[in-house]
Interface confidence: low
Amino acid sequence: HNTTVFQGVAGQSLQVSCPYDSMKHWGRRKAWCRQLGEKGPCQRVVSTHNLWLLSFLRRWNGSTAITDDTLGGTLTITLRNLQPHDAGLYQCQSLHGSEADTLRKVLVEVLADPLDHRDAGDLWFPGESESFEDAHVEHSISRSLLEGEIPFPPTS
Protein backbone atom coordinates (compact mmCIF):
# COMPACT_ATOMS: atom_id res chain seq x y z
CA HIS A 1 0.00 0.00 0.00
CA ASN A 2 1.18 3.49 -0.83
CA THR A 3 0.82 6.02 1.95
CA THR A 4 -1.62 8.88 1.38
CA VAL A 5 -0.80 12.17 3.08
CA PHE A 6 -3.57 14.23 4.69
CA GLN A 7 -2.61 17.66 5.95
CA GLY A 8 -4.59 19.46 8.62
CA VAL A 9 -4.22 22.66 10.56
CA ALA A 10 -3.75 22.70 14.32
CA GLY A 11 -7.07 23.39 16.02
CA GLN A 12 -9.04 22.56 12.89
CA SER A 13 -10.99 19.46 11.92
CA LEU A 14 -9.33 17.06 9.47
CA GLN A 15 -11.32 14.59 7.38
CA VAL A 16 -9.61 11.47 6.12
CA SER A 17 -11.32 9.41 3.43
CA CYS A 18 -10.57 5.82 2.61
CA PRO A 19 -12.23 4.47 -0.55
CA TYR A 20 -12.76 0.74 -0.92
CA ASP A 21 -14.54 -1.85 -3.05
CA SER A 22 -18.01 -1.99 -1.49
CA MET A 23 -18.71 -5.48 -2.82
CA LYS A 24 -15.43 -6.98 -1.71
CA HIS A 25 -15.86 -5.58 1.80
CA TRP A 26 -19.62 -6.13 2.02
CA GLY A 27 -20.74 -6.89 5.57
CA ARG A 28 -17.40 -5.97 7.13
CA ARG A 29 -16.96 -3.48 9.93
CA LYS A 30 -14.15 -0.93 9.58
CA ALA A 31 -11.59 0.56 11.93
CA TRP A 32 -9.08 3.35 12.22
CA CYS A 33 -5.83 2.54 13.95
CA ARG A 34 -2.56 4.27 14.71
CA GLN A 35 0.70 2.66 13.63
CA LEU A 36 3.10 2.30 16.56
CA GLY A 37 6.50 2.52 14.97
CA GLU A 38 7.47 1.48 11.45
CA LYS A 39 6.89 -2.23 12.05
CA GLY A 40 4.94 -2.11 15.28
CA PRO A 41 1.28 -3.00 15.81
CA CYS A 42 -1.59 -0.81 14.70
CA GLN A 43 -3.42 0.40 17.81
CA ARG A 44 -7.18 0.65 17.37
CA VAL A 45 -8.51 4.19 17.80
CA VAL A 46 -12.12 3.79 16.78
CA SER A 47 -14.28 1.33 14.85
CA THR A 48 -17.64 1.46 13.13
CA HIS A 49 -20.91 0.40 14.74
CA ASN A 50 -21.12 -3.18 15.99
CA LEU A 51 -24.08 -3.69 13.68
CA TRP A 52 -22.81 -3.39 10.12
CA LEU A 53 -26.17 -2.07 8.89
CA LEU A 54 -25.69 0.89 11.23
CA SER A 55 -22.17 1.67 10.01
CA PHE A 56 -23.38 5.01 8.70
CA LEU A 57 -23.84 6.21 12.29
CA ARG A 58 -20.91 8.31 13.42
CA ARG A 59 -19.01 6.83 16.34
CA TRP A 60 -16.65 8.90 18.46
CA ASN A 61 -13.66 8.02 20.59
CA GLY A 62 -12.46 11.23 22.16
CA SER A 63 -11.84 13.67 19.33
CA THR A 64 -11.87 11.02 16.57
CA ALA A 65 -15.01 9.99 14.70
CA ILE A 66 -15.66 7.28 12.13
CA THR A 67 -18.52 6.73 9.70
CA ASP A 68 -18.88 4.32 6.81
CA ASP A 69 -20.77 4.72 3.54
CA THR A 70 -21.09 1.02 2.85
CA LEU A 71 -22.93 1.48 -0.45
CA GLY A 72 -20.59 4.10 -1.86
CA GLY A 73 -17.53 2.40 -0.44
CA THR A 74 -16.02 5.29 1.50
CA LEU A 75 -14.85 5.22 5.09
CA THR A 76 -14.54 8.69 6.62
CA ILE A 77 -12.56 9.55 9.72
CA THR A 78 -12.79 12.97 11.35
CA LEU A 79 -10.03 14.19 13.63
CA ARG A 80 -11.49 17.09 15.58
CA ASN A 81 -9.41 19.89 17.10
CA LEU A 82 -6.27 18.53 15.47
CA GLN A 83 -3.14 18.80 17.61
CA PRO A 84 0.58 18.29 16.85
CA HIS A 85 0.57 14.97 18.72
CA ASP A 86 -2.01 13.64 16.26
CA ALA A 87 0.62 13.59 13.51
CA GLY A 88 1.74 10.14 12.47
CA LEU A 89 0.97 6.98 10.54
CA TYR A 90 -2.50 5.48 10.59
CA GLN A 91 -4.44 2.79 8.77
CA CYS A 92 -8.00 2.36 7.59
CA GLN A 93 -8.90 -1.27 8.11
CA SER A 94 -11.60 -3.70 7.06
CA LEU A 95 -12.31 -6.26 9.78
CA HIS A 96 -13.19 -9.91 9.34
CA GLY A 97 -13.02 -12.14 12.34
CA SER A 98 -9.76 -11.51 14.14
CA GLU A 99 -8.10 -10.39 10.90
CA ALA A 100 -7.88 -6.90 9.42
CA ASP A 101 -7.20 -5.87 5.83
CA THR A 102 -5.55 -2.53 5.23
CA LEU A 103 -7.71 -0.29 3.06
CA ARG A 104 -5.33 2.67 3.09
CA LYS A 105 -2.19 3.76 4.87
CA VAL A 106 -2.46 7.38 5.95
CA LEU A 107 0.14 9.88 7.07
CA VAL A 108 -1.44 12.70 9.05
CA GLU A 109 0.56 15.91 9.01
CA VAL A 110 -0.36 18.72 11.38
CA LEU A 111 0.46 22.20 10.11
CA ALA A 112 0.97 25.09 12.47
CA ASP A 113 -1.61 27.83 12.90
CA PRO A 114 -1.21 29.87 9.71
CA LEU A 115 -2.07 33.05 11.53
CA ASP A 116 0.46 32.58 14.29
CA HIS A 117 2.37 35.73 13.37
CA ARG A 118 0.46 37.63 16.03
CA ASP A 119 2.45 38.52 19.09
CA ALA A 120 0.96 37.72 22.47
CA GLY A 121 -1.90 40.08 23.16
CA ASP A 122 -2.20 41.07 19.52
CA LEU A 123 -5.38 40.50 17.58
CA TRP A 124 -5.59 38.62 14.31
CA PHE A 125 -3.90 41.23 12.15
CA PRO A 126 -2.18 44.48 13.11
CA GLY A 127 -5.21 46.46 11.96
CA GLU A 128 -7.82 44.06 13.25
CA SER A 129 -9.08 46.24 16.08
CA GLU A 130 -10.01 48.89 13.51
CA SER A 131 -11.18 46.48 10.82
CA PHE A 132 -13.43 44.20 12.87
CA GLU A 133 -16.76 45.05 14.37
CA ASP A 134 -19.71 43.20 15.80
CA ALA A 135 -21.36 40.96 13.23
CA HIS A 136 -24.98 39.94 13.00
CA VAL A 137 -25.45 36.18 13.14
CA GLU A 138 -28.67 34.69 11.83
CA HIS A 139 -30.18 31.78 13.79
CA SER A 140 -26.73 30.55 14.72
CA ILE A 141 -26.73 26.91 15.72
CA SER A 142 -23.43 25.09 15.94
CA ARG A 143 -21.85 22.20 17.76
CA SER A 144 -20.73 22.79 21.33
CA LEU A 145 -17.00 22.99 21.84
CA LEU A 146 -15.06 20.77 24.15
CA GLU A 147 -13.63 22.56 27.15
CA GLY A 148 -10.34 24.08 26.14
CA GLU A 149 -10.90 23.38 22.45
CA ILE A 150 -9.65 26.12 20.18
CA PRO A 151 -11.21 25.91 16.73
CA PHE A 152 -9.09 27.15 13.88
CA PRO A 153 -7.90 29.84 13.78
CA PRO A 154 -7.45 30.40 17.51
CA THR A 155 -7.50 33.81 19.11
CA SER A 156 -4.62 35.07 21.15
Epitope: V9, Q12, S13, Q15, R80, L111, P114, D116, H117, D119, W124, F125, P126, G127, E128, E130, S131, F132, E133, D134, A135, V137, S140, S142, R143, L145, I150, P151, F152, P153, P154, T155
Partner: antibody, heavy 118, light 112 residues
Framework: EVQLVESGGGLVQPGGSLRLSCAAS????????MSWVRQAPGKGLEWVSV??????????GYNPSVKGRFTISRDNSKNTLYLQMNSLRAEDTAVYYC?????????WGQGTLVTVSS | DIVMTQSPDSLAVSLGERATINCQSS???????????LNWYQQKPGQPPKLLIY???TRASGVPDRFSGSGSGTDFTLTISSLQAEDVAVYYC?????????FGQGTKVEIK
Protein backbone atom coordinates in the same frame (compact mmCIF):
# COMPACT_ATOMS: atom_id res chain seq x y z
CA GLU B 1 -15.18 17.36 -0.42
CA VAL B 2 -15.27 21.08 0.28
CA GLN B 3 -17.85 22.90 -1.83
CA LEU B 4 -18.88 26.56 -1.94
CA VAL B 5 -21.81 27.62 -4.12
CA GLU B 6 -22.71 31.28 -4.54
CA SER B 7 -26.08 32.64 -5.62
CA GLY B 8 -28.04 35.89 -5.63
CA GLY B 9 -26.19 37.86 -8.29
CA GLY B 10 -27.93 39.83 -10.98
CA LEU B 11 -28.57 43.23 -12.49
CA VAL B 12 -29.31 46.09 -10.11
CA GLN B 13 -29.58 49.85 -10.51
CA PRO B 14 -27.11 52.24 -8.87
CA GLY B 15 -28.19 52.88 -5.29
CA GLY B 16 -29.96 49.53 -5.16
CA SER B 17 -29.43 46.52 -2.93
CA LEU B 18 -28.63 42.84 -3.41
CA ARG B 19 -28.01 39.92 -1.09
CA LEU B 20 -25.54 37.22 -2.05
CA SER B 21 -25.53 33.75 -0.52
CA CYS B 22 -22.85 31.08 -0.34
CA ALA B 23 -23.83 27.52 0.60
CA ALA B 24 -20.91 25.65 2.17
CA SER B 25 -20.45 21.91 2.59
CA UNK B 26 -17.71 19.37 3.24
CA UNK B 27 -16.18 20.99 6.32
CA UNK B 28 -17.07 22.17 9.82
CA UNK B 29 -18.44 25.57 8.86
CA UNK B 30 -18.34 27.07 12.36
CA UNK B 31 -14.59 26.46 12.67
CA UNK B 32 -13.60 28.63 9.75
CA UNK B 33 -13.20 32.25 8.83
CA MET B 34 -15.14 32.93 5.62
CA SER B 35 -14.62 35.70 3.13
CA TRP B 36 -15.86 37.43 0.00
CA VAL B 37 -13.48 38.38 -2.80
CA ARG B 38 -14.57 40.12 -6.00
CA GLN B 39 -13.24 40.48 -9.52
CA ALA B 40 -14.40 43.22 -11.89
CA PRO B 41 -14.78 42.04 -15.52
CA GLY B 42 -11.32 41.60 -17.05
CA LYS B 43 -9.67 42.93 -13.89
CA GLY B 44 -7.81 41.61 -10.86
CA LEU B 45 -8.91 40.37 -7.45
CA GLU B 46 -10.09 42.56 -4.58
CA TRP B 47 -10.74 41.30 -1.06
CA VAL B 48 -14.14 42.52 0.18
CA SER B 49 -14.96 41.18 3.62
CA VAL B 50 -14.32 38.47 6.18
CA UNK B 51 -16.29 37.00 9.07
CA UNK B 52 -14.55 35.13 11.82
CA UNK B 53 -15.42 31.78 13.36
CA UNK B 54 -17.39 30.71 16.44
CA UNK B 55 -14.37 31.06 18.70
CA UNK B 56 -14.10 34.68 17.63
CA UNK B 57 -17.79 35.53 18.04
CA UNK B 58 -18.39 35.79 14.29
CA UNK B 59 -17.07 39.34 14.17
CA UNK B 60 -16.61 40.91 10.75
CA GLY B 61 -14.08 42.96 8.85
CA TYR B 62 -14.36 44.98 5.66
CA ASN B 63 -12.30 46.55 2.93
CA PRO B 64 -12.56 50.35 3.34
CA SER B 65 -14.01 50.52 -0.18
CA VAL B 66 -17.21 48.77 0.98
CA LYS B 67 -17.36 49.52 4.69
CA GLY B 68 -20.68 51.01 5.70
CA ARG B 69 -22.40 49.72 2.56
CA PHE B 70 -21.83 45.95 2.73
CA THR B 71 -22.61 43.59 5.60
CA ILE B 72 -21.26 40.06 5.89
CA SER B 73 -23.12 37.49 7.99
CA ARG B 74 -23.50 33.77 8.36
CA ASP B 75 -26.27 31.35 9.26
CA ASN B 76 -24.49 28.44 10.86
CA SER B 77 -27.65 26.32 11.04
CA LYS B 78 -27.71 26.42 7.23
CA ASN B 79 -23.95 26.46 6.61
CA THR B 80 -24.49 29.61 4.60
CA LEU B 81 -22.52 32.83 4.23
CA TYR B 82 -24.18 36.07 3.14
CA LEU B 83 -23.19 39.44 1.76
CA GLN B 84 -25.81 42.19 1.99
CA MET B 85 -24.86 44.93 -0.46
CA ASN B 86 -26.54 48.33 -0.19
CA SER B 87 -26.00 51.67 -1.96
CA LEU B 88 -24.48 49.82 -4.91
CA ARG B 89 -22.28 51.70 -7.36
CA ALA B 90 -21.16 51.00 -10.91
CA GLU B 91 -17.68 50.17 -9.58
CA ASP B 92 -19.18 47.31 -7.53
CA THR B 93 -19.86 45.43 -10.77
CA ALA B 94 -17.90 42.19 -10.47
CA VAL B 95 -17.97 38.46 -10.02
CA TYR B 96 -18.25 37.86 -6.27
CA TYR B 97 -16.50 34.81 -4.92
CA CYS B 98 -17.07 33.18 -1.57
CA UNK B 99 -13.83 31.75 -0.14
CA UNK B 100 -12.73 29.84 2.92
CA UNK B 101 -9.83 31.40 4.78
CA UNK B 102 -6.95 29.39 6.22
CA UNK B 103 -3.36 29.99 5.06
CA UNK B 104 -4.91 32.03 2.35
CA UNK B 105 -8.13 31.64 0.45
CA UNK B 106 -7.86 27.87 0.13
CA UNK B 107 -11.27 27.03 -1.36
CA TRP B 108 -13.36 29.20 -3.68
CA GLY B 109 -16.82 29.02 -5.14
CA GLN B 110 -17.46 29.51 -8.85
CA GLY B 111 -18.68 33.06 -8.26
CA THR B 112 -21.85 35.02 -8.94
CA LEU B 113 -22.00 38.06 -11.23
CA VAL B 114 -23.29 41.35 -9.91
CA THR B 115 -23.94 44.06 -12.49
CA VAL B 116 -24.72 47.59 -11.30
CA SER B 117 -26.10 49.62 -14.19
CA SER B 118 -28.96 51.92 -15.05
CA ASP C 1 -2.64 49.63 2.53
CA ILE C 2 0.15 47.37 1.34
CA VAL C 3 0.56 47.76 -2.44
CA MET C 4 1.46 44.65 -4.42
CA THR C 5 3.05 45.12 -7.86
CA GLN C 6 3.63 42.27 -10.30
CA SER C 7 5.89 42.07 -13.34
CA PRO C 8 5.63 41.40 -16.16
CA ASP C 9 1.95 41.91 -16.97
CA SER C 10 2.16 39.03 -19.45
CA LEU C 11 4.64 36.35 -20.28
CA ALA C 12 4.98 33.92 -23.23
CA VAL C 13 7.08 30.83 -22.59
CA SER C 14 7.73 27.70 -24.64
CA LEU C 15 6.45 24.37 -23.36
CA GLY C 16 8.99 22.77 -21.05
CA GLU C 17 10.77 26.09 -20.44
CA ARG C 18 11.00 28.04 -17.19
CA ALA C 19 8.53 30.82 -16.38
CA THR C 20 9.34 33.44 -13.78
CA ILE C 21 6.86 35.93 -12.29
CA ASN C 22 7.90 38.72 -9.95
CA CYS C 23 5.96 40.46 -7.20
CA GLN C 24 6.97 43.41 -5.05
CA SER C 25 5.28 44.64 -1.86
CA SER C 26 5.37 48.20 -0.54
CA UNK C 27 6.11 46.87 2.95
CA UNK C 28 8.07 43.89 4.21
CA UNK C 29 5.92 40.79 4.61
CA UNK C 30 8.58 39.09 6.74
CA UNK C 31 7.47 38.73 10.33
CA UNK C 32 9.75 38.34 13.33
CA UNK C 33 8.70 34.68 13.54
CA UNK C 34 10.59 34.06 10.29
CA UNK C 35 7.53 33.51 8.13
CA UNK C 36 6.78 35.65 5.10
CA UNK C 37 3.07 36.21 4.55
CA LEU C 38 2.91 36.11 0.77
CA ASN C 39 0.57 33.87 -1.24
CA TRP C 40 0.38 32.96 -4.92
CA TYR C 41 -2.81 32.02 -6.77
CA GLN C 42 -3.47 30.58 -10.21
CA GLN C 43 -6.62 31.51 -12.13
CA LYS C 44 -7.46 29.66 -15.31
CA PRO C 45 -9.96 31.14 -17.79
CA GLY C 46 -13.52 30.88 -16.54
CA GLN C 47 -12.47 29.44 -13.17
CA PRO C 48 -12.04 30.79 -9.65
CA PRO C 49 -8.51 31.30 -8.36
CA LYS C 50 -6.63 28.41 -6.77
CA LEU C 51 -4.17 28.72 -3.89
CA LEU C 52 -0.73 27.58 -5.07
CA ILE C 53 1.79 28.83 -2.53
CA TYR C 54 1.52 30.17 1.02
CA UNK C 55 4.16 31.52 3.42
CA UNK C 56 6.07 32.61 0.29
CA UNK C 57 7.46 29.14 -0.46
CA THR C 58 5.15 26.40 0.86
CA ARG C 59 3.16 24.58 -1.83
CA ALA C 60 -0.52 24.08 -1.09
CA SER C 61 -1.84 20.53 -1.04
CA GLY C 62 -1.90 18.89 -4.48
CA VAL C 63 0.20 21.54 -6.23
CA PRO C 64 2.83 20.05 -8.58
CA ASP C 65 6.44 20.52 -7.54
CA ARG C 66 7.26 22.41 -10.74
CA PHE C 67 5.74 25.41 -8.95
CA SER C 68 8.01 27.08 -6.43
CA GLY C 69 8.02 30.34 -4.52
CA SER C 70 10.98 32.31 -3.24
CA GLY C 71 12.00 35.82 -2.28
CA SER C 72 12.87 38.19 0.50
CA GLY C 73 10.75 40.53 2.63
CA THR C 74 9.53 42.69 -0.25
CA ASP C 75 10.60 40.95 -3.48
CA PHE C 76 9.09 37.64 -4.46
CA THR C 77 9.24 35.18 -7.33
CA LEU C 78 6.95 32.42 -8.54
CA THR C 79 8.78 29.95 -10.76
CA ILE C 80 7.29 27.30 -13.01
CA SER C 81 10.32 25.12 -13.72
CA SER C 82 8.91 23.41 -16.83
CA LEU C 83 5.82 25.03 -18.28
CA GLN C 84 2.96 22.67 -19.16
CA ALA C 85 -0.06 23.45 -21.33
CA GLU C 86 -2.33 23.33 -18.27
CA ASP C 87 -0.30 26.11 -16.62
CA VAL C 88 -1.74 28.74 -18.97
CA ALA C 89 -3.43 31.10 -16.53
CA VAL C 90 -3.24 34.41 -14.72
CA TYR C 91 -1.12 34.35 -11.56
CA TYR C 92 -1.69 36.65 -8.61
CA CYS C 93 0.40 37.40 -5.55
CA UNK C 94 -1.33 38.44 -2.33
CA UNK C 95 -0.14 39.74 1.02
CA UNK C 96 -1.58 38.00 4.06
CA UNK C 97 0.12 40.06 6.73
CA UNK C 98 -2.50 42.68 7.50
CA UNK C 99 -5.80 44.23 6.58
CA UNK C 100 -6.93 44.91 4.00
CA UNK C 101 -5.64 41.88 2.12
CA UNK C 102 -4.27 43.11 -1.20
CA PHE C 103 -3.46 41.36 -4.48
CA GLY C 104 -1.07 42.13 -7.29
CA GLN C 105 -2.64 43.07 -10.63
CA GLY C 106 -1.91 39.65 -12.11
CA THR C 107 0.49 38.16 -14.66
CA LYS C 108 -0.86 36.33 -17.69
CA VAL C 109 1.20 33.28 -18.69
CA GLU C 110 0.81 31.98 -22.25
CA ILE C 111 2.50 29.42 -24.48
CA LYS C 112 5.02 30.78 -26.97
Amino acid sequence: EVQLVESGGGLVQPGGSLRLSCAASGFTFTDFYMSWVRQAPGKGLEWVSVIRNKANAYTAGYNPSVKGRFTISRDNSKNTLYLQMNSLRAEDTAVYYCARLTYGFDYWGQGTLVTVSS
Amino acid sequence: DIVMTQSPDSLAVSLGERATINCQSSKSLLHSNGKTYLNWYQQKPGQPPKLLIYWMSTRASGVPDRFSGSGSGTDFTLTISSLQAEDVAVYYCQQFLEFPFTFGQGTKVEIK
